[in-house]
């Protein structure tokens, strides 16, 4: 007996969709082996129509998919736009078609929906609109038109042409009588509710010569689309509810016990605290469609989500909705990385960002999540040499360590840098991760002078003091530019005197610029690293001026100005124009990210995500 289990018979009608769920024992081998859906032939073979390895037969192109849910031990075959040609005997199975690990499914597609015993069948989704058409003869053209609903044995008046509307339909029903040429009246019901389903009778006239027409209204809750995403990854819910609700408030909610649906985010500014820092509701298009992105997926995010439209910004009876069942795969391909990174004012952080290692050539981005309105994430830096103007000299995106991880370094930290940041690429949109930067009490570990002025043609020596805790780290100086930080030669000057309670292992490492030129002006960083993993950095701006007196300049900590709490870039710095993203795949649905790179840096409150995965500014 095969251990595969599914529905034995599936019956539907032309034009409809089916979702066929097949169960299998969730052993390690079964979870990863090929899943297939095949059609049994007259001679006993079984021709594959779709498989989990990406094969889709031309018969199913554009209308079918197969999704595996390894943790549940199920896979689901969705087939849309059914025709009577799809009727037949099928198998859902594992491995090779002929090996017997399969289950027989009979699919029967009949004609319809249409007239059934002279009853017109209307099948409409919850929250949508139905138009019931009622023909009549000329002799009843001037007579009363009405629509009744069969409740038990008795017809109850819903609406008529004299102006009566049943209280259950107030504000969402109308009766239209077509022009004199057409012998037809229509009843339009909006914001359909489940309770609207049933048998209706429309009538023209009230005597024995009246014209009658039966209608069967079926109101469907949408079947949830199954979505399976990796722990720590991201999910995007695309919600298209139709132009008729383009100007109505939109929401995404998560079903809790029973019929309750707790708002996750809505266009009225509400956002559930559990999603702070990791959700964006992207602006809607003219047709009313919108999308919601959630990053940093957690185990507890799994569940049924509904998007909908209602003036209250939450689920109400009659809201048009779309549904998803989100499964979060705990056997994630996305590696663990700290969700909280801590730094001190004036100090720095080095953030490790994972990406899909198969996409090493993709463009990497880092953006700052902003909670205002529906959430947005203006880009701060990318791997193509663009850095937001306000971050010049203190932000760098490095491709190291590579092989699935890039590094973002932010220094000269202030309290305004606290907040949530997203790592992303223009490749696999599922690999978006969130990190929270927290600014904590303390002093920066690296000590450098504040403002330094060099003289043209002379020599400049800039010191950087490293405490003994970094004795085993590689120490470096580099010159910052938009594409990274180019390493420069430096000299170890022996133990530093800048630290109390610090032994011979502290170090003073100097940067020497010989025969200073105008090209030497700019930002210089000193820092520590271990292999390709970066730790703390400190930044110094070197200005270059004309010679006043001969000699070289040796800058000490005492002589230098103290670093200001926040660097305000003067007008001499080139503002990089708002650079459009070249790859159209990046956030096609998330315009806020691409269109708002030039937004000013606003004040942000940090919200504690309660994560235990934290990292200090200098740790790996």
């Amino acid at each position: 007996k095969s251990p595969i289990f599914g529905p034995e018979e599936v019956n539907s009608v032309e034009g409809n969709s089916v979702s066929i769920t097949c169960y299998y024992p969730p052993t390690s081998v079964n979870r990863h082996t090929r899943k297939y859906w095949c059609r049994q032939g007259a001679r006993g073979g079984c021709i594959t129509l779709i498989s989990s390895e990406g094969y889709v037969s031309s018969k199913y192109a554009g209308r079918a998919n197969l999704t595996n849910f390894p943790e549940n031990g199920t896979f689901v075959v969705n087939i849309a736009q059914l025709s009577q040609d799809d009727s037949g005997r099928y198998k859902c199975g594992l491995g090779i078609n002929s090996r017997g690990l399969s289950f027989d499914v009979s699919l029967e597609v009949s004609q319809g929906p249409g007239l059934l015993n002279d009853t017109k069948v209307y099948t409409v989704d919850l929250g949508r609109t139905v138009t019931i058409n009622c023909p009549f003869k000329t002799e009843n053209a001037q007579k009363r038109k009405s629509l009744y609903k069969q409740i038990g044995l008795y017809p109850v008046l819903v609406i008529d042409s004299s102006g009566y509307v049943n209280p259950n339909y107030t504000g969402r029903i109308r009766l239209d009588i077509q022009g004199t040429g057409q012998l037809l009246f229509s009843v339009v019901i909006n914001q359909l509710r489940l309770s609207d389903a049933g048998q209706y009778l429309c009538q023209a006239g009230d005597d024995s010569n009246s014209n009658k027409k039966n209608a069967d209204l079926q109101v469907l809750k949408p079947e949830p689309e199954l979505v399976y995403e990796d722990l720590r990854g991201s999910v995007t819910f695309h919600c298209a509810l139709g132009p008729e609700v383009a100007n109505v408030a939109k929401f995404l909610c998560r079903q809790s016990s029973g019929e309750n649906c707790d708002v996750v985010v809505n266009t009225l500014g509400k956002r559930a605290p559990a999603f702070e820092g990791r959700i964006l509701l992207n602006p809607q298009d003219k047709d009313g469609s919108f999308s919601v992105v959630i990053t940093g997926l957690r185990k507890e995010d799994a569940g049924r989500y509904l998007c909908g439209a209602h003036s209250d910004g939450q689920l109400q009876e009659g809201s048009p909705i779309q549904a998803w069942q989100l499964f979060v795969n705990e056997e994630s391909t996305i590696p663990r990385s700290p969700t909280v990174v801590k730094g001190v004012a004036g100090g720095s952080v080095a953030v490790l960002c994972p990406y899909n290692r198969k996409e090493s050539k993709s463009i990497k981005y880092w953006c700052l999540w902003e909670g205002a309105q529906n959430g947005r994430c203006p880009l701060l830096v990318d791997s193509e040499g663009w850095v937001k103007a306000q971050y010049e000299g203190r932000l760098s995106l490095l491709e190291e360590p590579g092989n699935g991880t890039f590094t973002v370094i932010l220094n000269q930290l202030t309290s305004r840098d606290a907040g949530f940041y997203w790592c992303l690429t223009n490749g696999d949109t599922l690999w978006r991760t969130t990190v929270e930067i927290k600014i904590i009490e303390g002093e920066p570990n690296l000590k450098v002078p504040g403002n330094v002025t060099a003289v043209l043609g002379e020599t400049l020596k800039v010191p950087c003091h490293f405490p003994c805790k970094f004795s085993s780290y590689e120490k470096y100086w580099c010159k910052w530019n938009n594409t990274g930080c180019q390493a420069l030669p430096s000299q170890d000057e022996g133990p530093s005197k800048a630290f109390v309670n610090c032994d011979e292992n502290s170090r003073l490492v100097s940067l020497t610029l010989n025969l200073v030129t105008r090209a030497d002006e700019g930002w210089y960083w000193c820092g520590v690293k271990q292999g390709h993993f970066y730790g703390e950095t400190a930044a110094v701006y070197v200005a270059v001026e004309e010679r006043k007196a001969a000699g070289s300049r040796d800058v000490s900590l005492a002589k230098a100005d103290a670093a200001p709490d926040e660097k305000v870039l003067d007008s001499g710095f080139r503002e990089i124009e708002n650079k459009a993203i070249q790859d159209p795949r990046l956030f096609a649905e998330e315009k806020a990210v691409a269109d708002t790179r030039d937004q000013a840096d606003g004040s942000r409150a940090s919200v504690d995500s309660g994560s235990s995965e934290e990292q200090g500014g200098s740790s790996r």
Partner: nanobody, 127 residues
């Protein structure tokens, strides 16, 4: 208020057939699950056959023990659910219940999904 009333039970010899009916009233939705369950004396209630109905689409599921012998069907015009039982065996002896509940994704043979139950009809198969 949903009401489910079963009928068609009785005594039959092994190898014989019975057809159970379940008259459903008060159900307005066009999206729900309906099923036949049974409970033998001293045993737990178990799913036999069920049907997920989503408008004009339906999915029929059977327990392994009855596959090929029992068939579930419905007649919408009469608001009736049926269970045709052929090749009956003594181990099919039990009280048979009709149940209705929220539409389910995937199989519908699990008890917790059902909110409305009939009072049951007894089926006895003697050898």
């Amino acid at each position: 208020q949903v009401q489910l009333v079963e009928s068609g039970g009785g005594s039959v010899q092994a190898g014989g057939s019975l057809r159970l009916s379940c008259q459903v009233s008060g159900y307005t939705g066009s999206q729900h699950s309906m099923g036949w369950f049974r409970q033998a004396r001293g045993k737990e209630r178990e799913g036999v056959a069920c049907i997920n109905i989503n408008g004009m689409t339906s999915y029929k599921w059977y327990d392994d023990s009855v596959k090929g012998r029992f068939a579930i069907s419905q007649d919408n015009t009469k608001n009736t659910l049926y269970l045709q039982m052929n090749s009956l065996k003594p181990e099919d002896t039990a009280m048979y219940y009709c149940a209705a509940g929220r539409y389910q994704l995937g199989h519908c043979l699990a008890l917790p999904a059902y909110t409305d139950w009939g009072r049951g009809t007894q089926v006895t198969v003697s050898s």
